[in-house]
């Protein structure tokens, strides 16, 4: 994993400007881990970043991710009067100019370098789950969440009508 200590320094300059025409309502620098306390880490390999899910050694420093929160109307057409309410969208940036992207064709989660305005594939609906966990649902593909598969992040289709264990789409955010 590479160090991301520089994140704090560029945070303000990077995110003061608007993204998709609006500014984030708030930002949060946090480490990302799975429900089972494995760390999400980012490594530079062959000039591109890879994302890993791994157990860190006791004193190994966790990588940080900058979460930028945005307000959004729910895209559902179930209620024309807007009663479905506003929700929170989030973008995740582990290092300058790179954001997590949903690759729906490959069912993968990738780090892409991109300029603003960010594409829809970089936005995820934040779900507030129990046990102080969150889930991230693809803006571009409702019902598809960031999850853990074979020690990597992947896109996982979740059907609310199915009875299955969802621990693999639960994540913890921590400032430490």
């Amino acid at each position: 994993a590479f160090g991301i200590s520089g994140v704090q320094k560029y945070t303000r300059a990077l995110h003061d400007s608007s993204i998709t025409g609006i500014s984030p309502i708030t930002e949060y620098l946090a480490s990302l881990s799975t429900y089972n306390d494995q760390s999400i880490t980012f490594a530079l390999e062959d000039e591109s970043y890879e994302i890993y899910v791994e157990d860190l050694k006791k004193d190994e420093k966790k990588d940080k991710v900058l979460l930028s929160y945005y307000e959004s109307q729910h895209p559902s057409n179930e209620s024309g009067d807007g009663v479905d309410g506003k929700m929170l969208m989030v973008t995740l940036s582990p290092t300058k100019d790179f954001w997590l992207h949903a690759n729906n064709k490959e069912h993968s989660v990738e780090l892409h370098k991109c300029e603003k305005p960010l594409p829809d594939q970089a936005f995820f609906v934040l779900h507030n789950m129990h046990s102080n966990c969150v889930s991230f649902e693809c803006k571009t593909d409702p019902g598809v969440f960031i999850g853990v598969k074979d020690n990597h992040l992947a896109l996982i289709k979740v059907d609310s009508s199915e009875n299955l264990c969802t621990e693999n789409i639960l994540f913890k955010l921590s400032e430490t």
Epitope: T26, H74, V83, D84, S160, L173
Partner: antibody, heavy 121, light 111 residues
């Protein structure tokens, strides 16, 4: 139109039981966490119970004051959430609101009109 | 449990004037870098209606005169210019931890 309609309220003696129902319409019921919130006459709001989704194993949570006496459940095929209330006490007298949390689960944004439960001998 | 305390219990404000309601939590309601604090309005004989979520974001269709602020344990709901239709009881609620707890309510009337 998004709607929640409660039923099953009424007069019951202390120690008795009652089952409240809440029929949902106008949205995909199985996608939303459901809650019950009550309001005693002339008093404030008190959250009672919550049930999550099938893929969350329908996990449930309760206020301490009703734990062990009240049970929340749902039937997604009928678009209905229930509140089974046992060992009722005079202090359970209240209007009981069925409520839906928003998509993402940060707040309640759809409420029923409420059903009155009166516990008295 | 997180205890939510509102002040004042009641408030009389002239039409067009500013109304301010405070809410204090017994412990921080912050998580994930946000404050999980909501404000609801309840008119007589009606269910509550969401005004503000995560401390400062307006609910859908809520007039701009309603705004929220604060973080951690101290929060404020402001009605910038009170209208006759704003007469109601206002509740804060934390949705950080179960049990989700409400403040005791603040009754807003016209002076």
């Amino acid at each position: 139109e998004v709607q929640l309609v409660e039923s099953g309220g009424g007069l019951v003696q202390p120690g008795g039981s009652l089952r409240l129902s809440c029929a949902a319409s106008g949205f995909t019921f199985s996608n939303y966490w459901m809650n019950w919130v009550r309001q005693a006459p002339g008093k404030g709001l008190e959250w009672m119970a919550e049930i999550t989704l099938k893929f969350n194993n329908y996990s449930t949570h309760y206020a301490e004051s009703v734990k062990g006496r009240f049970t929340i459940s749902r039937d997604d095929s009928k678009n209905t959430v229930y509140l089974q209330m046992n060992s009722l006490r005079a202090e359970d007298t209240a209007v009981y609101y069925c409520a839906r949390r928003n998509y993402g689960n940060y707040y309640i944004n759809v409420w029923g009109q409420g059903t009155l439960v009166t516990v008295s001998s | 449990d997180i205890v939510m305390t509102q002040s004042p219990d009641s408030l009389a404000v002239s039409l067009g004037e500013r109304a301010t309601i405070n809410c204090r939590a017994s412990e921080s309601v912050d998580k994930f870098g946000m404050s999980f604090l909501n404000w609801y309005q309840q008119k007589p004989g009606q269910p509550p209606k969401l005004l503000i979520f995560v401390a400062s974001s307006q609910g859908s269709g809520v007039p701009d005169r309603f705004s929220g602020s604060g973080s951690g344990t101290d929060f404020t709901l402001t009605i910038s210019s009170l209208q006759a239709e704003d007469v109601a009881v206002y509740y804060c609620q934390q949705s950080k931890d179960i049990p989700y707890t409400f403040g005791q309510g603040t009754k807003v009337e016209i002076k």
